[in-house]
């Protein structure tokens, strides 16, 4: 969380942003809140990106003002207009690109004063892994697949029974470039698995960490997976 204060002639207002990550090809949110004003027409929101030749987005007098928007953001940005009055200046970014990564500034002017706060926005690709029993293999084998990752992640296997065991010798991980030539499909195979055990396939890069669990017993297979974004700090 980053909290910024204005320092100019009028009073300062508190602006709060949260560092976040965008999944390339999907829509993302750059979060920003501020002390609300009673009149929408008195609120100006400017989103800036470090080193960019124009504005990312501007909202003033109750509507978008995009005459100074930089070409790389044209047609891809929107604020939540109905929520501005309650202090939400968050920006929706459509079709996140790798090049959208960087430092952004949420700059607010209201009748109470001015304020701004920066946020770090990371971009990459991350997806939920799915772990299955590979019945085609000659021995008991698990196959962990995740369709989209970037940058290239690390893959680590763990087991509930053999806690702390190193499975690198009995696993094989491959990365296959997807058709858009940026993201990659992750496939990891774990050999010599035993029943009545829970295995976890953990995929991690500097943006996200995802885990796929599988519990194999004589009578059933249970799966669970979750994904966590890393470094979500508020300003």
């Amino acid at each position: 969380l980053i909290i910024g204060f204005g320092i100019s002639g009028r009073h300062s207002i508190t602006v709060t942003t949260v560092a976040s990550a965008g999944n390339i090809g999907e829509d993302g949110i750059l979060s920003c809140t501020f002390e609300p004003d009673i009149k929408l027409s008195d609120i100006v929101i400017q989103w800036l990106k470090e080193g960019v030749l124009g504005l990312v987005h501007e909202f003033k007098e109750g509507k978008d003002e995009l005459s100074e928007q930089d070409e790389m953001f044209r047609g891809r940005t929107a604020v939540f207009a109905d929520q501005v009055i309650v202090g939400n200046a968050s920006l929706r970014l459509k079709n996140v690109q790798l090049t959208d990564a960087g430092t952004y500034k949420c700059y607010i002017i209201t009748s109470k004063g001015k304020g701004n706060a920066n946020l770090e926005y990371k971009t990459g690709a991350f997806s939920m892994p799915e772990v299955n029993v590979d019945y085609n293999a000659s021995s008991e084998t698990l196959r962990c697949e995740a369709p989209r990752w970037f940058p290239q992640p690390t893959v680590v296997w763990a087991s509930q029974v053999d806690q702390g065991a190193n499975f690198s010798e009995v696993s094989n991980t491959s990365f296959e470039l997807n058709s858009e030539n940026v993201t990659m499909k992750v496939v990891s195979v774990l050999y010599n698995v035993t029943i009545n055990n829970t295995y976890s396939c953990m995929i991690e890069n500097d943006i996200a960490k995802a885990t796929g669990d599988i519990k194999v017993t004589e009578s059933e297979i249970k799966r669970r997976s979750h994904l966590q974004l890393l470094n979500s700090k508020a300003s």
């Epitope: 960019v52 030749l53 100074e68 960087g102």
Partner: antibody, heavy 122, light 107 residues
Framework: EVQLLESGGGLVQPGGSLRLSCAAS????????MSWVRQAPGKGLEWVSA????????QYADSVKGRFTISRDNSKNTLYLQMNSLRAEDTAVYYC???????????????WGQGTLVTVSS | DIQLTQSPSTLSASVGDRVTITCRAS??????LAWFQQKPGKAPKLLIY???SLEGGVPSRFSGSGSGTEFTLTISSLQPDDFATYYC?????????FGQGTKVEIK
């Protein structure tokens, strides 16, 4: 200390090509847009081209559009200007300048190189 | 592209004079205007950005004002070091443009 050092100028024939470089130091290069500005002998300043910090956006003056290409290599802290189909009227001292960090909120053209002379003549 | 017109082209003044240079834009540029000083054989020096913000290290006798299409640079009391050529410059999301320059010379 911020420093910008241009190189690559010289004498070239009309229709020829030249590539200017600008080596930057003393600041986080990728955080700033960069520009090229030129000044013909005894004339005023003319902005030529600009490029965003990440290299994703570029701008050109109408007089050079389609002939000049601006680029940057952030790993080398270097700005470039590829000049093709050169004309006599392109003769000038070419400056690289540090452009904005934050559009509308920060200084721009606050640091300049010493300039490199490009002469287009047969 | 946006055109900038400076006036006058040349200005003769004496030390201690109050000097005003005008810059007009062909369309509204809000406050996206900077002022530069250039001396012969030297690179330009930034004086004012965002129409009225004084660059660090620049003497307070320099000031800028205006918004939209009309801008002014004022030197409240001209000093010997101030004889030079002054340029306005607009910046927006698709271009930058300089004015043609105003030469301030000794009367």
């Amino acid at each position: 200390e911020v420093q910008l050092l241009e190189s690559g100028g010289g004498l070239v024939q009309p229709g020829g090509s030249l590539r200017l470089s600008c080596a930057a130091s003393g600041f986080t290069f990728s955080s700033y847009a960069m520009s090229w500005v030129r000044q013909a002998p005894g004339k005023g300043l003319e902005w030529v081209s600009a490029i965003s910090g990440g290299g994703g956006s570029t701008q050109y003056a109408d007089s050079v559009k389609g002939r000049f290409t601006i680029s940057r290599d952030n790993s080398k802290n270097t700005l470039y200007l590829q000049m093709n189909s050169l004309r006599a009227e392109d003769t000038a001292v070419y400056y690289c300048a540090r452009d904005i960090q934050w559009f509308g909120e920060s200084t721009l053209f606050d640091y300049w190189g010493q300039g490199t002379l490009v002469t287009v003549s047969s | 592209d946006i055109q900038l017109t400076q006036s006058p082209s040349t200005l003769s003044a004496s030390v201690g004079d109050r000097v005003t240079i005008t810059c007009r834009a062909s369309q509204s540029i809000r406050s996206w205007l900077a002022w530069f000083q250039q001396k012969p054989g030297k690179a330009p020096k930034l004086l004012i950005y965002k129409a009225s913000s004084l660059e660090g290290g620049v003497p307070s006798r320099f000031s800028g004002s205006g918004s939209g299409t009309e801008f002014t640079l004022t030197i409240s009391s001209l000093q010997p070091d101030d004889f030079a050529t002054y340029y306005c410059q607009q910046y927006n999301s698709y271009s930058r443009t300089f004015g043609q320059g105003t030469k301030v010379e000794i009367k």
